[in-house]
Amino acid sequence: NECPKLQPPVYGKIEPSQAVYSFKDQVLVSCDTGYKVLKDNGVMDTFQIECLKDGAWSNKIPTCKIVDCGAPAGLKHGLVTFSTRNNLTTYKSEIRYSCQQPYYKMLHNTTGVYTCSAHGTWTNEVLKRSLPTCLPVCGQPSRALPNLVKRIIGGRNAELGLFPWQALIVVEDTSRVPNDKWFGSGALLSESWILTAAHVLRSQRRDNTVIPVSKEHVTVYLGLHDVRDKSGAVNSSAARVILHPDFNIQNYNHDIALVQLQKPVPLGAHVMPICLPRPEPEGPAPHMLGLVAGWGISNPNVTVDEIILSGTRTLSDVLQYVKLPVVSHAECKASYESRSGNYSVTENMFCAGYYEGGKDTCLGDSGGAFVIFDEMSQHWVAQGLVSWGGPEECGSKQVYGVYTKVSNYVDWLWEEMNSPRAVRDLQVER
């Protein structure tokens, strides 16, 4: 009634190990770490067999098969490479996830290395079984922005890709009779969000009520260089239009807004987001130089009043840009207080420009980002948004351009972009 001696499977063992097995003795077959018992095409951790009355074993000894984690999951905006030869996906094999550089980077700066674990899952030391997240790289244009730049007055043509965050916002308010059409600029913050000035998205009413335009009336163009040729640009409709709840038409305080795009836009050399500043009330320091781009008035011979009266919105065909220094709050406040008209430069604004004039933002540039290079992070940061200017012509002497101080609104922006009301799409890195 003895059963034949058992040979343990390769990469496995038998317990208990005895010299002799008699009727009713049982053995448990198990495999080494990283291997599983394979029996009749079924995979299990252990397998039990018994010595029968007739001296035969109840089953054949199963084999031990190496654990296979299978093909790794794809990564949005990323790719996976195999570190092991022959693209092995078995126990202890390694893969590496990476993001589509230079447009995306890995959140938390993890290595992206995953190992096939004994449990059959791809595992990372930090993220465990979770996949990494590829976030858009902000404020790093594929073309380096020029160091020296001489409406937008006194500016110059931007080359394609210099301001990849620049958005053209076109509003065609078909609810008006007759239809009303205007445009402004904005800045891409992520694949789905555009930052702009509230006054760009306020319905151009005959009273001073602040009502946002309907989302159906908003079109956003990204990767645009020349407005006469939109073929290479990405155009998107709006899913939501969000004006700052405290935007004041009388003094343009809180002149900031967001547009959530209907669909996330693909990032590339000509479409990349700008970074948001750290939330701090100081804003950019006086004399710091910033760049601002736009398709607004660039003809110094056309007056703003002529444009307003004619009802046309003369704009530059090719994106223009200018470099301007930040002006101290005290100097700016004083320059506006000396003017007739009720001008208040609040703590939510800062000014930029030259005392002698000649370089400025102008009608049609509204909502565009005033960007400053952050030496610490080596990124361009949206410190301001083109908001308003004095009663004189753009680029006039001692009339500084006024910009929304974005750093005062960072918390509000994150709140809105991550609110349950937002059409759910993607994560945005703080």
Epitope: S175, R206, D207, S214
Partner: antibody, heavy 114, light 112 residues
Framework: QVQLKQSGPELVKPGASVKLSCKAS????????INWVKQRPGQGLEWIGW????????KYNEKFTDKATLTVDVSSSTAFMELHRLTSEDSAVYFC???????WGQGTLVTVSS | DIVMTQSPSSLAVSAGEKVTMSCKSS????????????LSWYQQKPGQSPKLLIY???TRESGVPDRFTGSGSGTDFTLTISSVQAEDLAVYYC????????FGGGTKLEIK
């Protein structure tokens, strides 16, 4: 074409309420506020308030806060104004207007008399 | 509250004459940021609804004859009819939309 059609004349008793209607057609109803204006016989125009159909936001002339209630029914593109606790002072023609006063209704005459 | 004062309260002119009427507000109606004065002019003919003529102080509503011109800024505004026609017999109202809305008392235009 754009039209604002107001309900017919009303003869009401003092202390009662009356609900006037203004049916809009020919434009985007939800994107344009509806204004209501009062005109007493032989007198000038007095703004009562407005309602924005997209979200129901209302703004009132302080004088009419307790007198008038503005509502809309988006499904029928109709705006309503209910006047409460009527007195002879409320006898007037009431106009609705929209698309920022580009279009006006023909007016509804309300007469308060016992 | 913003008070709107119109003058004169009535005037009579012959057809073909030029007429001006004034509207003053108790505070400025100019919003510097938008470079707009939030003032409108209306015409109300006998037994009819008011009709918008001018908005933003000087922008003519579509379909309004060019003999009607609005001017002024801040607190002082004027409506000018360059050559009065018989059909211009009406009451003319100004209205501020700087802070909610307030109408002026009206100017009654009669034809001699």
């Amino acid at each position: 074409q754009v039209q604002l059609k107001q309900s017919g004349p009303e003869l009401v008793k003092p202390g009662a309420s009356v609900k006037l209607s203004c049916k809009a057609s020919g434009y985007t109803f939800t994107s344009n506020d509806i204004n209501w204006v009062k005109q007493r016989p032989g007198q000038g125009l007095e703004w009562i308030g407005w309602i924005y159909p997209r979200d129901g936001t209302t703004k009132y002339n302080e004088k009419f806060t307790d007198k008038a209630t503005l509502t809309v029914d988006v499904s029928s593109s109709t705006a309503f104004m209910e006047l409460h606790r009527l007195t002879s002072e409320d006898s007037a023609v009431y106009f609705c207007s929209s698309v920022e006063d580009s279009y006006w209704g023909q007016g509804t005459l309300v007469t308060v008399s016992s | 509250d913003i008070v709107m004062t119109q003058s004169p309260s009535s005037l009579a002119v012959s057809a073909g004459e030029k007429v001006t009427m004034s509207c003053k507000s108790s505070q400025s109606l100019l919003i510097s940021r938008t470079r707009k004065n939030y003032l409108s002019w209306y015409q109300q003919k006998p037994g009819q609804s008011p009709k918008l003529l001018i908005y933003w102080a000087s922008t003519r509503e579509s379909g309004v004859p060019d003999r009607f011109t609005g001017s002024g800024s801040g607190t002082d505004f004027t409506l000018t009819i360059s050559s009065v026609q018989a059909e211009d017999l009406a009451v003319y109202y100004c209205k501020q939309s700087y802070n909610l809305y307030t109408f002026g008392g009206g100017t009654k235009l009669e034809i001699k």
